[in-house]
């Protein structure tokens, strides 16, 4: 059957009907419903929400909706033994203690089960010692401290400001520097936008607000006790000493009121430059230790959190495809939150709910998508992407054979300025074409397309007249699908103006103040940005599931491969003496990129000309497109990161949130001048060039004529 036969409605009408059915008022209602109580992973409240979503998705008309449960390692504070940090005097008396909880927002004073701020998976411990201020605790910050300033963090408690990089990387860096504890805090320079009031009068972070979050370094492993395999009823679990990615030193987060008390006494070295100064009225001295009058005082951490194997629940909904039921397009976002989840994740979950409702409405009218659509409400994302990863581990054989695309649906907004998209190059043209058909919600762009406002506000740095689309990194549920399984993936949300707002993320991220009211009063009162994000996410899913030929353009991969090869080559050429000494050649990589470009171009020509009424040829061409992303997977994975298997993209080794291109070569080159054995180090560079060149060539050959 053709797509039109199977669906009984013309394709154009389908898409229009689907988009027209999406309503801002519904998203608003759903967001309210999802944010009235906390939905922490592993709690009864989040299980009840899973059952509610299961029931509603069934009502909306999905063919089946099942719960998929796993027993994974989670982390919680001890209810009777709270975590805190003290300043102690020479007698060991606590002369200052950090707060035990965030002051609840108005209207939420009587809500129970608000988890106090903590760093999930911190080990227990009560270290005491001198403080060292380490800026953002990035790799380069520790280089500055250790190499330039000759400051030794060994045996010290470090205090780092949140922002710039994933908190787990900060903790890893502190551990490697020999620290015995880490204090994380939100500096107003990063979490308080000038001219905006703090919550509840605006969207800024108050002094008592604190960012929760996990501090794992999982590198894509999922449940720390069952890496590579689902945490099911008969799972073999590692002992805690062999668990993947757990931090080895105590870690705790605080707000800027408490940080002020710790930082105002700091002595030792002055900050190396202005980039180490935040906005508090403190000197930002690096330390170690407190200044003269307070030099006998120390900092002591009191951490009593516990790691517990706990049951989590994903909700998996299926809308069976009429023509190709064995081809899966997946829309997934998480449901678990740190507290109320006003933005993260429920602004995304509410959009998914409305997308499901719209698809269900069409299905009830007799329509079906060409391909199967799977909808997922993931659990335990905040604890390390656990729900999505365990499900993908359990279903990996199906996914690697049948997975067409994965669209992520976490927070719909992190601002209200313009669209932000991160995706595989295969989806660039899909995103461009879709956004040209959607109306912009932006003031001053009435009657203009989303593409136009997006391009104006966030132009591509390389191509004039086109919008910026970023590389996929990690820190969200697409990770296992893209980085491990090689399924084409994308994400979209509304974002802030990065030019004028330099704070990291949004100020109230992972705090108790991330409420429904935050969104309804300050970010999107009309829910028009939510609706636009629903149209983008839903529209992408619709096209991926319903277009006769998959809406992937392999030529866009050729363009970025050349750009990434150029970039990694230029990084390598910064070491000309070693390049020459070890005769490091990039010929194989540039040759492979050239071949990929030529083969992709020929494939695109054949794609225009083939007989689309021949179902065998159609399926063959679509399979070549579907499996192209898969062809970039190296079954052996990246060095020391076996679950990051994509050769073109991986999360940066220095910031999980950021994507790195040709990560194997990049990591081999990183700080190569400090390696003790240069010959071995440059040998690894050459090996990584070989792996990259082979992979690009092999991927190119999947696009060649089959015989």
């Amino acid at each position: 059957k053709s797509s039109n036969e199977a669906t009984n409605i013309t394709p154009k009408h389908n898409m229009k009907a689907f988009l027209d059915e999406l309503k801002a008022e519904n998203i608003k209602k759903f967001l309210y419903n999802f944010t009235q109580i906390p939905h922490l992973a592993g709690t009864e409240q989040n299980f009840q929400l899973a059952k509610q979503i299961q029931s509603q998705w069934k009502e909306f008309g999905l063919d089946s909706v099942e719960l998929a449960h796993y027993d994974v390692l989670l982390s919680y504070p001890n209810k009777t033994h709270p975590n805190y940090i003290s300043i102690i005097n020479e007698d060991g008396n606590e002369i200052f203690n950090t707060s035990l909880f965030e002051p609840p927002p108005p209207g939420y004073e009587n809500v129970s089960d608000i988890v106090p701020p903590f760093s999930a998976f911190s080990p227990q411990g009560m270290p005491e010692g001198d403080l060292v201020y380490v800026n953002y605790a990035r790799t380069e910050d520790f280089f500055k401290l250790e190499r330039d300033m000759k400051i030794n963090c060994s045996g010290k408690i470090v205090i780092a400001r949140y922002g710039k990089v994933f908190r787990g990387n900060k903790v890893k860096n502190a551990q490697l520097a020999g620290a015995k504890g880490v204090i994380l805090y939100s500096d107003p320079a990063d979490y308080f936008a000038p001219g905006v009031k703090s919550y509840p009068d605006g969207w800024n972070l108050p002094g008592g607000g604190v960012q929760r979050g996990n501090i794992l370094n999982l590198n894509g492993a999922g449940d720390p006790l069952t890496p590579g395999y689902p945490a099911n009823e008969y799972a073999y679990r590692r002992g805690i000493a062999e668990a993947v990615g757990l931090p080895s030193i105590p870690v705790h987060p605080i707000g800027y009121y408490d940080a002020q008390k710790l930082l105002e006494k700091m002595g030792g070295s002055a900050p190396p430059d202005s980039s180490w100064r935040g906005s508090l009225k403190v000197p930002y001295n690096v330390g170690p230790g407190f200044t003269g009058n307070f030099s006998t005082q120390k900092v002591k951490m009191h951490i009593h959190s516990t790691n517990e194997v706990t049951r989590i629940y994903n909700v998996i909904g299926t809308l069976r495809g009429a023509v190709e039921p064995d081809r899966y397009v997946i829309l997934g976002g998480h449901r678990d939150s740190w507290v109320f989840g006003g933005i993260d994740p429920q602004s995304g979950a509410a959009v998914v709910h409305e997308i499901v409702r719209s698809f269900g409405t069409l299905k009830k009218e007799g329509w079906r998508p060409r391909r199967t659509i799977l909808f997922a409400s993931w659990d335990a994302e905040e604890f390390g992407l656990l729900g999505s990863t365990e499900w993908a581990e359990e279903n990996s054989r199906l996914l690697q054979e049948r997975g067409v695309a994965y669209i992520n649906a976490d927070s719909s907004i992190e601002g209200n300025y313009t669209l932000r998209v991160d995706c595989t190059p295969l989806m660039y043209s899909l995103v461009h074409n879709l956004t040209k058909e959607l109306k912009s919600p932006d003031e001053g762009f009435e009657g203009k397309s989303l593409y136009e406002s997006w391009t104006k506000k966030s132009p591509s740095p390389e191509f004039s007249g086109m919008p910026r689309i970023s590389k996929l990194g990690s820190g969200n549920d697409f990770e296992v699908f893209f980085q491990r399984l090689g399924i084409a993936s994308g994400r979209a949300r509304y974002t802030k103006n990065w030019e004028t707002n330099k704070f990291s993320g949004y100020p109230l991220y992972h705090s108790v103040y991330e409420t429904y009211e935050l969104v309804e009063k300050f970010y999107d009162p009309m829910f028009k940005y939510h609706l636009t994000v629903a149209q983008v996410r839903g529209g992408m899913v619709f096209e991926l599931a319903n277009s006769i030929v998959l809406p992937f353009d392999c030529r866009d991969y050729a363009v970025v491969l050349r750009k990434y090869a150029d970039k990694i080559y230029s990084i390598s050429m910064k070491h000309p003496q070693e390049m020459k000494t070890y005769s490091v050649s990039f010929d194989s990589l540039f040759s492979a990129v050239k071949n990929f470009t030529e083969i992709a171009s020929k494939f695109s020509e054949r794609l225009q000309d083939f007989d689309k009424s021949n179902p065998i040829v159609l399926r063959m061409m679509n399979d070549q497109l579907m499996f192209l992303e898969r062809a970039f997977i190296d079954p052996l994975g990246l060095p020391d990161r076996p679950f990051y298997r994509h050769v073109i993209y991986a999360p940066s080794s220095h910031n999980k949130y950021a994507g790195e291109s040709f990560p194997g070569i990049y990591d081999a080159l990183f700080d190569i001048e400090s390696k003790v054995d240069p010959s071995k180090a440059w040998g690894e560079v050459k090996r990584q060039i070989y792996v990259a060149a082979f992979t690009v060539q092999a991927a190119a050959e999947t696009l060649s004529e089959v015989a």
């Epitope: 390389e462 150029d566 990039f586 010929d587």
Partner: nanobody
Framework: EVQLVESGGGLVQPGGSLRLSCTVS????????VSWVRQAPGQGLEWVSS???????YYADSVKGRFTISRDNSKNTLYLQMNSLRAEDTAVYYC??????WGQGTLVTVSS
């Protein structure tokens, strides 16, 4: 056989300009990134600039804003336009494909 031949070096006064050329053969020039590298008297090799197959340009901090790298694929030629030259730019300038393929170099002397 890959060949890279530099030309355009010479003596120039501080503040002056020079344009170096590098003509290549033996490979499909348009498909490869290429670079300029220099070696000052008694010093090691120093990367100056690269231009990608896609035309993207990269510069060392020491020359940013003063030097411009470009390529003409139809002529199989790489260029380096050097403006506001300083005494510390004095060096032998090499055209390089990567670590394996280099030219013989052309001497640039900046002196009053």
């Amino acid at each position: 056989e890959v060949q890279l031949v530099e030309s355009g070096g010479g003596l120039v006064q501080p503040g002056g300009s020079l344009r170096l050329s590098c003509t290549v053969s033996g490979f499909t020039f348009s498909s490869y990134a290429v670079s300029w590298v220099r070696q000052a008297p008694g010093q090691g090799l120093e990367w100056v600039s690269s231009i990608g197959a896609g035309g993207g340009t990269y510069y060392a901090d020491s020359v940013k804003g003063r030097f411009t790298i470009s390529r003409d694929n139809s002529k199989n030629t790489l260029y380096l336009q050097m403006n506001s030259l300083r005494a510390e730019d004095t060096a032998v300038y090499y055209c390089a494909k990567d670590g394996a393929d280099w030219g013989q170099g052309t001497l640039v002397t900046v002196s009053s």
